[in-house]
Interface confidence: low
């Protein structure tokens, strides 16, 4: 066969669907690889062809679109399963071609099982809610296109294993779940089960997402440098190890890049000749506020090093701060016998 632009296996789009539920999968070519959409391709005389490779096999096979009740079908650029079976797991390829043009991409599809409490190997999307921030909503995700707007589905929401009814601050409102005031206790997995009829059959769509309650922007502050500070002096003798921690608190800020760095005499440590190492550790509070610690270490400090300026800097979307460490050379204790002897006029 003639050459085909092969985009390979698109593992970035690892698609997971639940067993025994409808699934609609769009060909990724039009979403991520080509500059035109399906309608344009179709009107230009291009044909979309689907095939697949079963799990643990190398053989590419055509997809059987003649199964009972049209269990698998194709509609425009969408591959439909009504419903999926466990052995539908495999790598699926969509190929767009005519006599002069060919482009294809493969993607993995995994059909997963869930238990009665909706636990499964499914990777769950995370939805962040601001703590004590007034009414916030989550929406049952990825249900568009499964049924026409004339169909009114029934939606049931669960937190973990429990149906949400008569919860204090969580109220189901159709496709939305409203949190009147989000609290840490609202952290957890939430599942919506959408039930709808189609051609005399009843289908269920199960969607689970993780809710994580995070720090509110109204509580956010610029970075706070806890160390170094004015209350600790790093007093060292030449030859000793100098260790200075820079500990910075960052309020949670959505999509903020938190940065901590040291300067020595105004330069980044990489730009100076002294043998300095920096180790970083990061911890998070329950609301994803972040504490970063960068420990500056000079194994054998010299008297020159003890005269330098060591400044810890921090930056987030809320602002930039800096704090200098108080470093000084330890005055050696008097050598008692010699000085005493000198004091008595000994020579």
């Amino acid at each position: 066969s003639e050459r085909c632009d092969d985009w390979g296996l698109d593992t970035m789009r690892q698609i997971q669907v639940f067993e025994d539920e409808p699934a609609r999968i769009k060909c990724p070519l039009f979403e991520h690889f080509l500059k035109f959409n399906y309608s344009t391709a179709h009107s230009a005389g291009l044909t979309l062809i689907w095939y697949w490779t079963r799990q643990d096999r190398d053989l590419e096979e055509p997809i059987n679109f003649r199964l009972p009740e049209n269990r698998i079908s194709k509609e425009k650029d969408v591959l439909w399963f009504r419903p999926t079976l466990l052995n539908d797991t495999g790598n699926y390829t969509c190929m767009l071609r005519n006599t002069t043009y060919c482009s294809k991409v493969a993607f993995p599809l995994e059909v997963v099982q869930k238990d009665s409490c909706f636990n499964s190997p499914m990777k769950l999307p995370v939805h962040k809610l601001y703590i004590e921030y007034g009414i916030q909503r989550i929406t049952c995700p990825n249900v568009d296109g499964y049924f026409p707007s004339s169909v009114k589905p029934t939606i049931t929401w669960y937190m973990g294993c429990y149906k949400i009814q008569n919860f204090n601050n969580v109220i189901p409102e159709g496709m939305n779940l409203s949190f009147l005031i989000a609290l840490i206790s609202n952290n957890g997995n939430y599942t919506c089960v959408v039930t709808y009829p189609e051609n005399g059959r009843t289908f269920h769509l199960t969607r689970t997402l993780t809710v994580k309650v995070v720090g509110s922007p109204k509580n956010a502050v610029p970075p706070v440098i806890h160390s170094p500070n004015d209350h600790v002096v790093y007093e060292k003798e030449p030859g000793e190890e100098l260790l200075i921690p820079c500990t910075v608190y960052f309020s949670f800020l959505m999509d903020s890049r938190n940065e901590v760095w040291w300067t020595i005499d105004g330069k980044k440590p990489d730009d100076i000749t002294i043998d300095v190492t920096i180790n970083e550790s990061i911890s998070h509070s329950r609301t994803e506020d972040e504490t970063r610690t960068q420990i500056l270490s000079i194994k054998k400090v010299t008297s020159e090093d003890l005269k330098r300026s060591y400044v810890c800097h921090a930056r987030s979307a809320k602002g930039e701060v800096a704090k200098a460490a108080k470093v000084k050379q330890k005055v050696p204790a008097p050598r008692y016998t010699v000085e005493l002897a000198c004091g008595f006029g000994a020579t």
Partner: antibody, heavy 118, light 111 residues
Framework: SVEESGGRLVTPGGSLTLTCTVS????????MGWFRQAPGKGLEWIGD??????STWYASWVKGRFTISSTSTTVDLKITSPTTEDTATYFC???????????????WGQGTLVTVSS | AQALTQTPSSVSAAVGGTVTINCQSS???????LAWYQQKPGQPPKLLIY???KLASGVPSRFKGSGSGTQFTLTISGVQSDDAATYYC????????????FGEGTEVVVK
């Protein structure tokens, strides 16, 4: 220095604003806290304000009944719908260190008495 | 909510003696930001110790703070009659912004 004012006798359900006037330091770099102490009882933290970023924090029991705000030289505490349990001496205090940290409060006012009674 | 339990609630000491006051937190205090205050009747609190063990400016060295995490102690050595007062511990927590909490207080009586 730090000085509270505005304490008085107020009826339940009314509203009252206490003012903390500061001098000798900038509110933009110090955190300020409001506290209260009922007669014969212990100290209770109400909330903090860090004017540098306009951020406020409140004790969990406050539930919107107290609001802290600031100008360049004052920090206000607004009490809405007070009850007899809000009868106390109210103190304003400054954090020991510039920059918002949690060390403690080293500069306190003498307090202002609020009596809630019908 | 965070709870700070101070013990004992009252302690009596002779001049020159030693007093130990404990403060236990129900959860870890952020960066050991625990302060100790002294309060005399009709006066505002006075900061004695901050950051668990640092002596505030002008405070005599007979006051000593120690501890970390959830367990903290204030020790007054060589107690003087002027030390008769109520002592409070105060912790700073970090969760949703910054949160403070006080212990219930310990009354120190000097005989």
């Amino acid at each position: 220095s730090v000085e509270e004012s505005g304490g008085r006798l107020v009826t339940p359900g009314g509203s009252l604003t206490l003012t903390c006037t500061v001098s000798g330091f900038s509110l933009s770099i110090y955190a300020m806290g409001w506290f209260r102490q009922a007669p014969g009882k212990g100290l209770e933290w109400i909330g903090d304000i860090y004017a540098g970023s306009g951020s406020t924090w409140y004790a969990s029991w406050v539930k919107g009944r107290f609001t802290i705000s600031s100008t360049s030289t004052t920090v206000d505490l607004k009490i809405t719908s007070p009850t007899t349990e809000d009868t106390a001496t109210y103190f304003c205090a400054r954090e020991i260190d510039a920059g918002y940290v949690g060390y403690g409060f080293n500069l306190w006012g003498q307090g202002t008495l609020v009596t809630v009674s019908s | 909510a965070q709870a700070l339990t101070q013990t004992p609630s009252s302690v009596s000491a002779a001049v020159g003696g030693t007093v130990t006051i404990n403060c236990q937190s129900s959860q870890s205090v952020y960066s050991d930001y625990l302060a100790w205050y002294q309060q005399k009747p009709g006066q505002p609190p006075k900061l004695l110790i901050y950051w668990a063990s640092k002596l505030a400016s002008g405070v005599p060295s007979r006051f000593k703070g120690s501890g970390s995490g959830t367990q903290f102690t204030l020790t007054i050595s060589g107690v003087q009659s002027d030390d008769a007062a109520t002592y409070y511990c105060q912790a700073t927590y970090n969760g949703r912004g910054w949160y403070r909490a006080f212990g219930e207080g310990t009354e120190v009586v000097v005989k």
